[in-house]
């Protein structure tokens, strides 16, 4: 029997800027039941707070509501292990909530074939920002990538779109029916989950772009 | 304890490329950026790009647009910064160095010595 | 790109008293998230750098309280309020506000 191993905060993500979760990773427990607590202050500030939600975001984590969430200041926190043989504790945590930004999908993937009379055909895609995210404020950048593929193909065809929220693609495969989704992200955050599959038939007279 | 270990000095032609490793201990390597900065003998710093190891997404400076390429290798929690068409004003030292959930650098390297000389 | 304008370039000080270095941005550091990333370094002789103040005026963990920062939109100082022996090296200042990130071209502290 011993006391816990160091824990480690490894994961924090905020889906807007107006909430964010931490999660840990245990260390070894000493083979005695062990509690974990968090506990932080922001810059600043020397009065250490306790973790406010340990439920929301599942086990070993902490969640911050919109009441306890602020982009001015950093967050300094760290998580406390103890069993009847001692304690250990992280390393201190340093939280921007502008840098841990995981946005939702994206919303609205509508994929369509153009046929032009005087020009190639191409796929059209066009999506919307997820509706967490306030792009008026200026600072949040969203940037944004395409996957596609054939149906029964393995490998998916990657495209960077930038901040772009449509997008034009000229080579594909006449007569097989694509999957295409989109994702995004902050500049300095995290990429979303893909958006769910659009399923779009590429007609079979689709001329192929040299 | 945090600990960014760099491989060692080299010396390279004009022309060449380097490729600088950077070794990461004491820490879940995909959770935070890792930043690449120079220092030119007798001067001061010039940050040339960052990582996200979670995903391999890079911001490079313009720069060096072009002549860098940073990577990271999950698998090794390892991270690197390859230069390419050496110049004598690429003679440097290179260091990596750490973010938090921010965008300063808590911890560096040791740094790496590149001698570009024909 | 940002350019970090540090005065002087060089500092002799004598132990106990203080030093000040100034930091001046070409463009205004405040962020429009409403944050100011400007950020202190020390390099000290033949080591790396290492990060002393966050944020314009946040003591970054284990550093000294006669360390301190200040400013606001392009104008920034780091006070040490009584200079030890330990603290010779070179001081930068860094921005993290706008891409490329870019340092001061540094201010060497030396002891009388």
């Known amino acids: 029997q011993l006391p816990p191993g160091k824990p480690e905060i490894f994961k924090c993500r905020s889906p807007n800027k107006e909430t964010f979760t931490c999660w840990w990773r245990p260390g070894t427990d000493g083979g005695l039941p062990t509690n974990y607590s968090l506990t932080y202050h922001r810059e600043g500030e020397t009065l250490m707070h306790e973790c406010p939600d340990y439920i929301t975001g599942g086990p070993n984590s902490c969640h911050f509501g919109k009441q306890y969430t602020s982009m001015w200041r950093t967050y300094i926190m760290m998580v406390n292990a103890t069993n009847q043989m001692g304690s250990s504790f992280s390393d201190e945590l340093y939280v921007d909530v502008t840098y841990i930004v995981q946005p939702d999908p994206p919303l609205e993937l509508a994929v369509e074939v153009k046929q032009p009379e005087d020009r190639k055909p191409y796929l059209w895609i066009k999506w919307s920002p997820p509706t967490l995210i306030d792009l008026k404020t200026g600072w949040f950048t969203l940037l944004y990538e395409i996957r596609l593929k054939p149906e029964k193909a393995a490998e998916w065809e990657i495209h960077f779109a930038g901040q772009q929220t449509e997008f034009k693609i000229l080579s594909l495969h006449p007569g097989q029916k694509y999957l295409v989704q989109v994702r995004c992200k902050p500049d300095h955050g995290y990429w979303s989950a893909w958006s769910p599959a659009t399923f779009i038939q590429i007609p079979s007279d689709f001329t192929m772009n040299d | 304890q945090v600990q960014l270990v760099q491989s060692g000095a080299e010396v390279k032609k004009p022309g060449s490329s380097v490729k600088v490793s950077c070794k990461a201990s004491?820490?879940?390597?995909?959770?935070?950026?890792i930043h690449w900065v120079r220092q030119a003998p007798g001067q001061g710093l010039e940050w040339m790009g960052e990582?996200?190891?979670?995903?391999?997404?890079?911001n490079y400076n313009q720069k060096f647009k072009g002549r860098v390429t940073i990577t990271a290798d999950k698998s090794t929690s390892t991270a690197y910064m390859e230069l390419s068409s050496l110049r004598s004003e690429d003679t440097a030292v290179y260091y990596c160095?750490?973010?938090?959930?921010?965008?300063?650098?808590?911890?560096w390297g040791q740094g790496t010595l590149v001698t570009v000389s024909s | 790109d940002v350019v970090m304008t540090q005065t002087p370039l060089s500092l002799s000080v004598t132990p106990g008293q203080p030093a000040s270095i100034s930091c001046r941005s070409s463009?205004?550091?405040?962020?429009?998230?409403?944050?100011?990333?400007l950020h202190w370094y020390l390099q000290k002789p033949g080591q790396s750098p290492q990060l002393l103040i966050y944020?314009?005026?946040n003591r970054f963990s284990g550093v000294p309280d006669r360390f301190s920062g200040s400013g606001s939109g392009t104008d920034f100082t780091l006070k040490i309020s009584r200079v030890e022996a330990e603290d010779v090296g070179v001081y930068y200042c860094?921005?993290?506000?706008?891409?490329?990130?870019?340092f001061g071209g540094g201010t060497k502290v030396e002891i009388k």
């Open positions: 160095a750490r973010s938090f959930f921010t965008n300063w650098f808590a911890y």
């Open positions: 463009q205004s550091l405040v962020h429009s998230n409403g944050n100011t990333y």
């Open positions: 004491g820490y879940t390597f995909t959770s935070y950026w």
């Open positions: 990582i996200d190891p979670s995903d391999s997404y890079t």
């Open positions: 944020k314009v005026s």
């Open positions: 860094s921005q993290s506000t706008h891409v490329p990130f870019t």
